[in-house]
């Protein structure tokens, strides 16, 4: 009689995570009598996966009925495979005894697990940045196997090239993670822009996973200010408007100053949205010129999104307007309707930055 051989016909088996793995093993003889055991790994630290003789192995089932006469097929199925199950599995024949002793091992079957990467998570900078600045975005995806993976960055569908990617760990592992950092230059038109991280892996069958970040969470577009004097409503009243244009996000507070003294503060509420996602807002001030003997310096001061204030001033010439008798108080009002620019031009075109 020829000596028993343990045949593991598959050198390697690849299984998708969550599926079952079938590991084939046959013996060539009924002799010697004794059980089959399956191990992961070799040597003293090997892990018992299945023991025909005894033990409870809830994930393992025998492919054939091992109690049936002349059975020589000791293939097993392992259910619900995870990346942690990867390794080399050995089918080992034992010889009956007290205790049973190892008789012969198969050559082993390497089980590799194909695990899908997790949905990429894209995160941007902690603080907002303004156009022309470069900001970094990170993309992370975990738990995939095998190690080979492709990551691409896009901004509004255009592929980016300025990024660095690492796959960890460098050595062998049951599963891997990818981390990538991309640099993006912001423009004033980026409120509606998206940054996309795209991950392609063998497990995804050509349908890559995408993670997105909206640049609206990252960008800050500072407003431009224009202060104009509108046509006179009444002989002693002047309407001055402050146009706040192209700002994002909406959080904005406006303060009117008359000769450096706070006249009124208000918060942007009824704004209009531009096509590019930025906002416009207008505030106006009715000034009773009869209450002023000298020229009035009107300043529109805007604090946008917690940043240092930006201001624009307009010099109101009192001499140009006759004073109305019997009135010595300044009448003020506000409005939020956008109006056309006045024929009057600003005397001061400069932005005044007040640092807090």
């Amino acid at each position: 009689e020829e000596e028993l051989q343990v045949i593991q016909p598959d050198k390697s088996v690849s299984v998708a995570a969550g599926e079952s793995a079938i590991l084939h093993c046959t013996v060539t003889s009924l002799i010697p009598v004794g059980p089959i055991q399956w191990f992961r790994g070799a040597g003293p630290a090997r892990e018992l996966i299945y023991n025909q003789k005894e033990g409870h192995f809830p994930r393992v089932t025998t492919v054939s009925e091992s109690t049936k006469r002349e059975n020589m097929d000791f293939s097993i199925s392992i259910s619900n495979i995870t990346p942690a199950d990867a390794g080399t599995y050995y089918c080992v024949k034992f010889r009956k005894g007290s205790p049973d002793t190892e008789f012969k091992s198969g050559a082993g079957t390497e089980l590799s697990v194909r695990a899908k990467p997790s949905a990429p998570v894209v995160s941007g900078p902690a603080a907002r940045a303004t156009p022309q600045h470069t900001v970094s975005f990170t993309c992370e995806s975990h738990g995939f196997s095998p190690r080979d993976i492709t990551l691409k960055w896009f901004k509004n569908g255009n592929e980016l090239s300025d990024f660095q990617t690492n796959v960890d760990p460098v050595g062998e592992s049951v599963s891997y993670s990818i981390h990538s950092t991309a640099k993006v230059v912001l423009t004033r038109e980026d409120v509606h822009s998206q940054v996309i991280c795209e991950v392609a892996h063998v497990t995804l069958q050509g349908d890559p996973l995408r993670g997105t970040a909206n640049l609206s969470e990252t960008i800050r577009v500072p407003p431009t200010l224009e202060v104009t004097q509108q046509p006179v409503r009444a002989e002693n009243q002047v309407n001055v408007t402050c146009q706040v244009r192209k700002f994002y996000p909406q959080r904005l507070q406006l303060t009117w100053l008359e000769n450096g003294n706070v006249s009124r503060t208000e918060t942007a509420s009824t704004v209009t949205e531009n096509k590019d996602g930025t906002y416009n807002w207008m505030s106006w001030l009715l000034v009773n010129v009869s209450a002023h003997r000298d020229d009035v310096k009107l300043t529109c001061q805007v604090e946008h999104d917690g940043q240092p204030a930006v201001s624009k001033s307009h010099d109101l010439k009192v001499s140009a307007h006759p004073k109305e008798q019997g009135s010595n108080t300044a009448a003020e009002n506000t409005g939020s309707n956008e109006r056309g620019s006045s024929d009057y031009k600003d005397d001061d075109d400069k932005h005044h930055h007040h640092h807090h």
């Epitope: 009689e1 009924l30 002799i31 009598v33 004794g34 059980p35 023991n51 025909q52 003789k53 005894e54 033990g55 009925e65 091992s66 109690t67 049936k68 006469r69 002349e70 059975n71 009956k96």
Partner: antibody, heavy 119, light 110 residues
């Protein structure tokens, strides 16, 4: 190690039934056949039947087919052999034995249960 | 059914001498290249103990003075040098079909 522990001796009257138990330990009960064999005093071995605890497949010696019933309780790893319509010539030691190689052989034996049938 | 006939029914052999027990099947017990014959030893008051499986393979823990041979219908159990502890009744069993036992051979010391 493999152990098969059988129930105690029984004395029965002719026409009665007996149910002998065999509790297995030291191995996975559902992975190996259990055989039942009897031996009358001073006589040889006589095979009664066998059962596969994994699916309750049974094979009976034609002589015992109508009177013997094998069952198992996998929750307690116990095999049972019931013999009905007892006669005096059923007096014997009844053994359970485990087939370790699926060769329909008897590798490990219980110590036996003496069943005495007497009026 | 396959009938197994053992010979002799009883045997007396001197210590250290060879003992030979025969088992003949009423038809072949061979299948798939294996001979489905098993030999058991039973001492008084004890259950039988498996000695030889598939005609010629020594079970674990069995002294190598025991051996089995034969094929088809004729099989032999041999004890090469009889020891006092070998006094027992020996049975052959087949499993080519449903199992049956031979009638047994009683081995004594001469």
């Amino acid at each position: 190690q493999v152990q098969l522990v059988q129930s105690g001796a029984e004395v029965k009257k002719p026409g009665a039934s007996v149910k002998v138990s065999c509790k297995a330990s030291g191995y996975t009960f559902t992975n190996y056949w259990i055989n039942w064999v009897r031996q009358a005093p001073g006589q040889g071995l006589e095979w009664i039947a066998m059962i596969d605890p994994s699916d309750s497949e049974t094979h009976y010696n034609q002589i015992f087919k109508d009177r013997a019933t094998l069952t198992t309780d996998t929750s307690t790893s116990t095999a049972y052999m019931e013999l009905r319509s007892l006669r005096s010539d059923d007096t014997a030691v009844y053994y359970c034995a485990m087939d370790y190689g699926s060769l329909y052989a008897m590798d490990y034996w219980g110590r036996g249960t003496l069943v005495t049938v007497s009026s | 059914d396959i009938v197994l006939t053992q010979s002799p029914d009883s045997l007396a052999v001197s210590l250290g001498e060879r003992a030979t027990i025969n088992c003949r099947a009423s038809k072949s017990v061979s299948s798939s290249g294996y001979n489905y014959i098993f030999w058991y030893q039973q001492k008084p008051g004890q259950p039988p103990k498996l000695l030889i499986y598939l005609a010629s393979n020594l079970d674990s823990g069995v002294p190598d003075r025991f051996s089995g041979s034969g094929s088809g219908t004729d099989f032999t159990l041999t004890i090469s040098s009889l020891q006092a502890e070998d006094v027992a009744v020996y049975y052959c069993q087949h499993s080519r079909e449903l199992p049956t036992f031979g009638q047994g051979t009683k081995l004594e010391i001469k």
